[in-house]
C-alpha cells in the first residue's frame, strides 16, 4: 500500500522542515522539577516499541509506522545500558536497583549494592541503597507505585525494598533460615520500610494470612492469603494513616480517587499479577491508565509535589510466553497511561521519563508490506516451503517440532491472541535481551537525558531534577508554580 | 565475575554524578557546520551496537559492557523510524534515499520518490530527489564516499544515483528494454551524475569492459570487467580532472592520500564488495579506518569544507549470513573509523552523525555471566537438553535440523568466525528488522538530533546545519575558523 500523498517529495520535505522547526525551538528548562514520574515498560526494548507503534496505529485504521505513540512525543532520548554487575543480560530486580536507586546490583537482588549476593540473607545488612522515591518522601513529596504486576514484584519493589531474593514476595517464600536471620519478605517491606501514599496493582495474596479467602475468588484456595506469620498487612497499613483506604475493585478505586478524605490509597486488584489487558474484566479491574489517573488525582494534592512509578509490567510476561499479541497490547495500554498522565500533568513542573528495564529476544522482520498486520506472515515462504511470521523470538516456548519439522502457520493462526511466535531455541520461558533500551524524557531537566548512559543515570537525573539527595545543592530555580 | 570496585555504591554514584556534570555542561553550538560526516552502519541495530560494545571491550581485556564505543561518546541520540513507503521493514536502497536525500522511497529503489516503482524504468524521470552530498558539492564543498561494500551498492548510491533497481550495478545488470528507455546503471551514474572528489571501496568489475582482467585476480574471469558498453569508466573519470588518481591497493592509497598533487581520488580495492575485516589482506586492501583517514586528508584541504559518507557496509552481510562474528567484527572496524575521524576533525566545525539504515532480527539473550564471550553459550540447557548460544536470529540460514532435531553446540563451535547462529525460521538470507535505529550526533547543530524522528530527518539536519538547500537562509553564525 503506497499512500498517494507520500509519493510527493513535498510531503517528506515539509514534514522534516516542521520537525526541524520543533527541534530548533526546544529550550532546556532551567527550573527544578516539582513532580517526578517514571514510566517503566518491563521488557519494552526498541523492537517492542516499534511493533507497538504499528499496532496502535493500525487500531486507529492507519497503516501503522507513521503514527506516534505518546512516548514518541517526548523530546529527549537516550540509550540506557542495562547489564547488571554480574550478568550481561539482566533481570528486573538488578535493573530496578539501577534506575530507581542509582546503583547497579546483582541478578535477582533488589535495592542492594553488588556487595550483596543472591539468596544469601547475611549479605543484606549494610548493603542497602536508597531509592529516589524514598528520598522524595523524605523531602516532603507524596509518592506512589502503580503496576500491572503484583506490587511486590521486582520492578516496583526497587522503589521501597531491599532483598537478596526477588522471589520473597511473602514470608511463605522466605526460607526459615533467612527469616531467622532477620530477612523480611517484600510485602512486609512494602508497608514498613517507608510511607507510600498510593499503592496500586496486584498482589493481594501476599498481604493476608494463609487461609484468608480472596474476595474475588473466595472458592479458589490457591488465590487466598499466603502469609505464615498470621499478619494482615493491609490492616496494619490502614492503621498507620487516618485517611488510608484499601480497595480491591475498579468501582471502589474510582470512588476513592475522587474522595478528598482519602490521603493514602492501596488498591490490590488481583491475588497475583493483574490480568493481561485483553483478559481484563473491566467491571472489576481497572486498567493501567485508570490506576495512573487515580494515583495522579491523589498525589497532585501535595503542594510539594510527588514521585510516581508507573509500570507496564506484563509486557515482559507476554514476551516470556512468546505471545507477542499479549506483549504488544500491554505496551499499548502502557502508552495509553503515559498519554493520560500527560493530560493530567504539566511539563512545566513535571519531569516524566519513559524507559524499559531490559529488552527481549523479540524481532520484527521479513519485509512485510506497509499496512499489513504486525501479527501476520512475511511475504513468500521459508526454505522449508512453509510460511513464517514477521514477529519471531530468538528463544522461548514457541519452538515446536511437528513430525520432526517446523510447523507451518496461517494468517489466522498467527493473529490469535494465544499464538506463540516460533523461536530458534526451545525454552520454557523466553529470555530477556541485553541490548540498550531507550529512555524518553520530557519536562524540567529532561535535556540531561542524552547520549548513551548507564541505567543508573536515570535515578540520578530524577534526583538532580527535583533537588533530592545527594543533589540538594542542585542550584536550580524553583519549579514553576511551586507553593513552597 | 563481579568487579570488586563495582560492589561499592560510591562507584556508581560517582560515575553518575560525573555523567550528570557532563550533561549539564552540554552547550548547543549556534554555529553552522563547515563539514558534514555521516557514518552509516548498514544493518547496525541497537542489538548490534550493544554486542559490538561488549566484544570491543573484551578485545581490550575488559569485561565488556562497561566500555565505550566511539559512537557511545557522541552527546546526542535520537531514534529513527526506518520503514519505507511500501514496506514496514525496509531495504538499504529506500533507506539511503531517506537519510541522504530527505525523502522516503519504495523498497529497492534509490534516489527516487515513492512515485517511482521498483524495476519500472519509465517511472524514473521526474521523480529524482537530490542528495545532501550533491547539494554540498553545489555549495563548493568537497565530497566523498567511503564504503566496505562495492561503491555502487545501495547505501553509497543514495548519495549520487537515481535508479528504480538497486541491483543495476553495471549495464550488464540492466535489462535491454530499460537501457533503451535511457535508464543508466549505477556505475555510470557514479562518474557522470556529479563530481565526487573521493570514492573509496569495492566495485572494480563494474567499471571496466567485459573481458578486462582484474589486476588482483587476473586469472579469475568472474572477477574481471562486466560492462557490455565497452566503456572504461575509471579512464573516463580520470580524464575529467587533472589531479585525479585511481588506486587499487593499500600502498597506493596511503601514498595518494598524502600527495598534495592529488585532488580527486578513486580507490577500488576489490572486484565486488571488499573482504570482511577478518579476511582482509592488510598488505593489499586498506581497512575502513584507513580509507576514512585517506578521505579526510584529501577533503579537509577545501577551506569551504566537505561532506563525507562512510559506510560499514558489511555489518549487514554478516547478519544476512547469520554469522554474528563477521557482523560484530565489521561493527568494531566501523567504530574504529569513527574514532579515527574524531582524531582528524574538530567538533567545533564538523557535524558527525552515526546511524544505521535498518536493523536485523538479531538478539542477545540467555542471561550470560558478565565477562563471558559474546559468542558463547547461555548458562544451562534448553528444553531439548542441548546447549544454546546467547546470540540468535529470528530467521536465517543458521536454522538446521539434524536427525529431525535442533543440533547441539559447543563453546568452541560457537566461537568460530564461520559459525552461523541458529534461527527460528530457515531462510537463505536472514532478513532486516523493522525496529527504530539509533542516531548519534556530535558537532554544530547536533542538538537538533532528538526524540523519535522519521529517517528523512537526518538529511534535513545535515542540510540545515551546513546551510545547504533548502536551508540556505539557515540564520546560523558562520562556523568557527571559516575562511570563506
Amino acid at each position: 500500500i503506497i499512500p498517494v500523498e507520500e509519493e510527493n517529495p513535498d510531503f517528506w520535505n515539509r514534514q522534516a522542515a516542521e520537525a526541524l522547526g520543533a527541534a530548533k525551538k526546544l529550550q532546556p528548562a532551567q527550573t527544578a522539577a516539582k513532580n517526578l514520574i517514571i514510566f517503566l515498560g518491563d521488557g519494552m526494548g526498541v523492537s517492542t516499541v516499534t511493533a507497538a507503534r504499528i499496532l496502535k496505529g493500525q487500531k486507529k485504521d492507519k497503516l501503522g509506522p507513521e503514527t506516534f505513540l505518546a512516548m514518541d512525543r517526548f523530546p529527549y532520548v537516550a540509550l540506557s545500558k542495562t547489564y547488571s554487575v554480574d550478568k550481561h543480560v539482566p533481570d528486573s530486580g538488578a535493573t530496578a536497583t539501577a534506575y530507581l536507586c542509582g546503583v547497579k546490583g546483582n541478578f535477582q537482588t533488589i535495592g542492594l549494592s553488588a556487595a550483596a549476593r543472591f539468596n544469601q540473607c547475611n549479605t543484606t545488612r549494610g548493603n542497602e541503597v536508597i531509592s529516589v522515591m524514598n528520598r522524595a518522601k523524605k523531602a516532603g513529596k507524596s509518592v506512589g507505585v502503580v503496576t500491572t504486576t503484583r506490587v511486590q514484584h521486582a520492578s516496583p519493589a526497587g522503589a521501597y525494598a531491599h532483598t537478596v531474593n526477588r522471589n520473597w514476595y511473602s514470608d511463605a517464600d522466605v526460607p526459615a533460615s533467612a527469616r531467622q536471620e532477620g530477612c523480611q519478605d517484600i510485602a512486609t517491606q512494602l508497608i514498613s520500610n517507608m510511607d507510600i501514599d498510593v499503592i496500586l496493582g496486584g498482589g493481594r495474596k501476599y498481604m493476608f494470612p494463609m487461609g484468608t479467602p480472596d474476595p474475588e475468588y473466595p472458592d479458589d484456595y490457591s488465590q487466598g492469603g499466603t502469609r505464615l506469620d498470621g499478619k494482615n498487612l493491609v490492616q496494619e497499613w490502614l492503621a498507620k494513616h487516618q485517611g488510608a483506604r484499601y480497595v480491591w475493585n475498579r468501582t471502589e478505586l474510582l470512588q476513592a480517587s475522587l474522595d478528598p478524605s482519602v490521603t493514602h490509597l492501596m488498591g490490590l486488584f488481583e491475588p497475583g499479577d493483574m490480568k493481561y489487558e485483553i483478559h481484563r474484566d473491566s467491571t472489576l479491574d481497572p486498567s493501567l491508565m485508570e490506576m495512573t489517573e487515580a494515583a495522579l488525582l491523589l498525589l497532585s494534592r501535595n503542594p510539594r509535589g510527588f514521585f510516581l512509578f508507573v509500570e507496564g509490567g506484563r509486557i515482559d510476561h507476554g514476551h516470556h510466553e512468546s505471545r507477542a499479541y499479549r506483549a504488544l497490547t500491554e505496551t499499548i495500554m502502557f502508552d495509553d497511561a503515559i498519554e493520560r498522565a500527560g493530560q493530567l500533568t504539566s511539563e512545566e513542573d513535571t519531569l516524566s521519563l519513559v524507559t524499559a528495564d531490559h529488552s527481549h529476544v523479540f524481532s520484527f522482520g521479513g519485509y512485510p508490506l506497509r499496512g499489513s498486520s504486525i501479527f501476520g506472515l512475511a511475504p513468500g515462504k521459508a526454505r522449508d516451503r512453509k510460511a513464517y511470521t514477521v514477529l519471531l523470538y530468538g528463544n522461548g516456548p514457541g519452538y515446536v517440532l511437528k513430525d520432526g519439522a517446523r510447523p507451518d502457520v496461517t494468517e489466522s493462526e498467527s493473529g490469535s491472541p494465544e499464538y506463540r511466535q516460533q523461536s530458534a531455541v526451545p525454552l520454557d520461558g523466553e529470555t530477556h535481551a541485553g541490548e540498550d533500551v531507550a529512555v524518553f524524557a520530557r519536562g524540567p531537566q529532561a535535556h540531561l537525558v542524552h547520549g548513551v548512559q548507564e541505567q543508573t543515570f536515570i535515578a540520578h537525573v530524577m534526583a538532580f531534577a527535583a533537588c533530592l539527595e545527594p543533589y540538594t545543592a542542585c542550584d536550580l530555580a524553583p519549579r514553576a508554580g511551586t507553593t513552597d | 565475575i563481579i568487579p570488586v570496585e563495582e560492589e561499592n555504591p560510591d562507584f556508581w554514584n560517582r560515575q553518575a554524578a560525573e555523567a550528570l556534570g557532563a550533561a549539564k555542561k552540554l552547550q548547543p553550538a549556534q554555529t553552522a557546520a563547515k563539514n558534514l560526516i555521516i557514518f552509516l552502519g548498514d544493518g547496525m541495530g541497537v542489538s548490534t551496537v550493544t554486542a559490538a560494545r561488549i566484544l570491543k571491550g573484551q578485545k581490550k581485556d575488559k569485561l565488556g559492557p562497561e566500555t565505550f564505543l566511539a559512537m557511545d561518546r557522541f552527546p546526542y541520540v535520537a531514534l529513527s523510524k526506518t520503514y519505507s513507503v511500501d514496506k514496514h521493514v525496509p531495504d538499504s536502497g529506500a533507506t539511503a534515499t531517506a537519510y541522504l536525500c530527505g525523502v522516503k522511497g519504495n523498497f529497492q529503489t534509490i534516489g527516487l520518490s515513492a512515485a517511482a516503482r521498483f524495476n519500472q524504468c519509465n517511472t524514473t524521470r521526474g521523480n529524482e530527489v537530490i542528495s545532501v552530498m550533491n547539494r554540498a558539492k553545489k555549495a563548493g564543498k568537497s565530497v566523498g564516499v567511503v564504503t566496505t561494500t562495492r561503491v555502487q551498492h545501495a547505501s553509497p548510491a543514495g548519495a549520487y544515483a537515481h535508479t528504480v533497481n538497486r541491483n543495476w550495478y553495471s549495464d550488464a545488470d540492466v535489462p535491454a528494454s530499460a537501457r533503451q528507455e535511457g535508464c543508466q546503471d549505477i556505475a555510470t551514474q557514479l562518474i557522470s551524475n556529479m563530481d565526487i572528489d573521493v570514492i573509496l571501496g569495492g566495485g572494480r568489475k563494474y567499471m571496466f569492459p567485459m573481458g578486462t582482467p582484474d589486476p588482483e585476480y587476473p586469472d579469475d574471469y568472474s572477477q574481471g570487467g562486466t560492462r557490455l558498453d565497452g566503456k572504461n569508466l575509471v579512464q573516463e573519470w580520470l580524464a575529467k580532472h587533472q589531479g585525479a588518481r585511481y588506486v587499487w591497493n593499500r600502498t597506493e592509497l596511503l601514498q595518494a592520500s598524502l600527495d598534495p598533487s592529488v585532488t580527486h581520488l578513486m580507490g577500488l580495492f576489490e572486484p565486488g564488495d571488499m573482504k570482511y575485516e577478518i579476511h582482509r589482506d592488510s598488505t593489499l586492501d586498506p581497512s575502513l579506518m584507513e580509507m576514512t583517514e585517506a578521505a579526510l586528508l584529501l577533503l579537509s584541504r577545501n577551506p569551504r569544507g566537505f561532506f563525507l559518507f562512510v559506510e560499514g557496509g558489511r555489518i549487514d552481510h554478516g547478519h544476512h549470513e547469520s554469522r554474528a562474528y563477521r557482523a560484530l567484527t565489521e561493527t568494531i572496524m566501523f567504530d574504529d573509523a569513527i574514532e579515527r575521524a574524531g582524531q582528524l576533525t574538530s567538533e567545533e566545525d564538523t557535524l558527525s552523525l552515526v546511524t544505521a539504515d535498518h536493523s536485523h532480527v538479531f538478539s542477545f539473550g540467555g542471561y550470560p555471566l558478565r565477562g563471558s564471550s559474546i559468542f558463547g553459550l547461555a548458562p544451562g540447557k534448553a528444553r531439548d537438553r542441548k546447549a544454546y548460544t546467547v546470540l540468535l536470529y529470528g530467521n536465517g540460514p543458521g536454522y538446521v535440523l539434524k536427525d529431525g532435531a535442533r543440533p547441539d553446540v559447543t563453546e568452541s563451535e560457537s566461537g568460530s568466525p564461520e559459525y552461523r547462529q541458529q534461527s527460528a525460521v530457515p531462510l537463505d538470507g536472514e532478513t532486516h528488522a523493522g525496529e527504530d535505529v539509533a542516531v548519534f550526533a556530535r558537532g554544530p547543530q547536533a542538538h537538533l538530533v532528538h526524540g523519535v524522528q522519521e529517517q528523512t530527518f537526518i538529511a534535513h539536519v545535515m542540510a540545515f546545519a551546513a546551510c545547504l538547500e533548502p536551508y540556505t537562509a539557515c540564520d546560523l553564525a558562520p562556523r568557527a575558523g571559516t575562511t570563506d
Epitope: - | K60, S300, Q343, S346, D349
Partner: antibody, heavy 117, light 111 residues
Framework: QEQLKESGGDLVKPGASLTLTCTAS????????VCWVRQAPGKGLEWIGC????????TYFASWAKGRFTGSKTSSTTVTLQMTSLTAADTATYFC??????????WGPGTLVTVSS | LVMTQTPSPVSAAVGGTVTISCQSS????????LAWFQQNPGQPPKLLIY???KLASGVPSRFKGSGSGTQFTLTISDVQCDDAATYYC????????????FGGGTEVVVK
Amino acid sequence: QEQLKESGGDLVKPGASLTLTCTASGFTLSTYWVCWVRQAPGKGLEWIGCIDTVSSGDTYFASWAKGRFTGSKTSSTTVTLQMTSLTAADTATYFCARRTGSGWTLWGPGTLVTVSS
Amino acid sequence: LVMTQTPSPVSAAVGGTVTISCQSSQSVYNNNYLAWFQQNPGQPPKLLIYWASKLASGVPSRFKGSGSGTQFTLTISDVQCDDAATYYCLGAYVSNGWYFAFGGGTEVVVK
C-alpha cells in the same frame, strides 16, 4: 589512572645508538598515535615523529630525523624510538605524548638523553 | 612547516590580559589544527587549547584560542600568578606525510 612513562634515557658517547620506550598504563595504545618530542636544555620543544598505533604502525618523522630515528609499536602498551648516530646536539629530554581527537592530551614526564664523550 | 611565535618575554600584571600570536608558514591541516601548550620548568607541556579554539578538559575559561588558516592567537584574560610559564603553539599539515611543528615558545612573566 591513565599515564605514559618514558624509559631508556642514558649517557652515551657520540655515534652510539639508543632505544627509548614509552609505556602506557591504564589504557592500551590500540586507537591512538604516540608522538615523540624533545627539548634541549634551556630550549624549546621540537617534534621528532609519530607512530600510528592503530593501523600497521605507520610512522611519520620530521625531515631532520628521517634515517637516524625510527619508531615502532612493540606491544599494546609500548612504543619505542630507536636513535642512531647520536651527536651532542641530540642531548635533550625526550617526551612521548598521546594524540587523540582532543589534542595531545597525555604526556610522559620525560627521560634525559645525554650525548657526551 | 614553520611556526613563528610572539617573541619572549611578554609581561602582564595580575588581572590583566596577555595575547600571544602564532603564525604558520602555510595553512594548517583543516585550517584549524593548532594547539597551545603551557610548560613550567622541569614539567612536560600541558595542553590548553586544541583545534585552534577548543578548551582542553580542566583548563580555566580565562584561556581562549582563536584564528584560522595561518594566523592564530592565545589570549589569557584575568592573568594569575601561576600563569607565568612558557607557551608553545603546535601546528600540523599533510603533504607526503604528516608534519608537526612547535613554535619557538613565548615566556609570560607576571608582575
